[in-house]
Interface confidence: low
């Protein structure tokens, strides 16, 4: 069966070769071919070329439509890694380092502390905060991590919060908090993470991260 296919392929290839050779001879004006025959072969060839070009145009149109569709609803995602900071601020600092994600300029990390989106929509926003604390060395208050939102023209608000009591382990016990939820964000909205004691946050690889994904 395969042999028959191979013979068919070779026959087609031979026919194509003969056809191209005939066009060549028509172009060089060989007298052995009648003018009528040449006109027929040329129009046949032009037909082939036209078909190929039309096919190409259609493909181009389809591709450009795909691109437009993609442009209208591009993937927006970010994942940033914690950064130790000398600042005493309760807002955690982040960096585009390690295995980070920043899909495009529709989401940006501003001042190393907040993720800002340029398009309105529903976003899944998450943060993981790992901290190491000790009951004796810490205040009575629990360690609290808050995911906060600042929208243009509006004041800051808390979207999610989680609290953990301090460990009795010495020198300190590692614990992780995970926050995650779906929220509607306006263009220019920023999200950031606040903690009660940034000095207790663990910045080792994979321990503390922050991100969002447009749904």
């Amino acid at each position: 069966h395969r042999r028959l296919d191979k013979i068919e392929d070779e026959r087609n290839l031979h026919e194509d070769f003969v056809f191209m050779k005939t066009i060549q001879r028509c172009n060089t004006g060989e007298r052995s071919l009648s003018l009528l025959n040449c006109e027929e072969i040329k129009s046949q060839f032009e037909g082939f070329v036209k078909d190929i070009m039309l096919n190409k145009e259609e493909t181009k149109k389809e591709n450009s439509f795909e691109m437009q569709k993609g442009d209208q609803n591009p993937q927006i995602a970010a994942h940033v890694i914690s950064e130790a900071s000398s600042k005493t601020t309760s807002v955690l600092q982040w960096a585009e380092k390690g295995y980070y994600t920043m899909s495009n300029n529709l989401v940006t990390l501003e001042n190393g502390k907040q993720l800002t989106v340029k398009r309105q929509g529903l976003y899944y926003i998450y943060a993981q905060v790992t901290f190491c604390s000790n009951r004796e060395a810490s205040s009575q208050a629990p360690f609290i991590a808050s995911l906060c939102l600042k929208s243009p023209g509006r004041f800051e608000r808390i979207l999610l919060r989680a609290a953990n009591t301090h460990s009795s382990a010495k020198p300190c016990g590692q614990q992780s908090i995970h926050l995650g939820g779906v929220f509607e964000l306006q263009p220019g909205a920023s999200v950031f993470v606040n903690v009660t004691d940034p000095s207790q946050v663990s910045h080792g690889t994979g321990f503390t991260s922050f991100g969002l994904l447009k749904l």
């Epitope: 208050a141 609290i144 808050s146 509006r154 004041f155 919060r161 009660t196």
Partner: nanobody, 116 residues
């Protein structure tokens, strides 16, 4: 109907103190995070401080950290802002604000002028 009424503003010398109050009505005060926002003459709105519903956590703008203290008394439906070590740049209309889902509720504001 949500109502927020600020009081306690006035003229004070640099380095002085003031305590602003905000009486809230028309909603369950103890369920909501509250905030103070200010608008200096000819400038935009600036978030100053916010406090969680039960008062357990407070947040401050860097410009007021260490000088201002936000607090609340849920039994009296009242929000407070204690302002110490006042500076000329703290001159503004101070608004008490409550977050809504699609927009924020504001009071009428109280004017604080810091001048010698």
């Amino acid at each position: 109907e949500v109502q927020l009424l600020e009081s306690g503003g006035g003229l004070v010398q640099p380095g002085g103190s003031l305590r602003l109050s905000c009486a809230a009505s028309g909603f369950t005060f103890s369920n909501y995070q509250m905030a103070w926002v200010r608008q200096a003459p000819g400038k935009g709105l600036e978030w100053v401080s916010s406090i969680t519903s039960e008062g357990g956590s407070t947040y401050y703008a860097d410009s007021v950290k260490g000088r201002f203290t936000i607090s609340r008394d849920n039994s009296k439906n009242t929000l407070y802002l204690q302002m110490n070590s006042l500076r000329a740049e703290d001159t503004a209309v101070y608004y008490c604000a409550k977050p809504g889902k699609n927009f924020d509720y504001w009071g009428q504001g109280t004017l604080v002028t810091v001048s010698s």
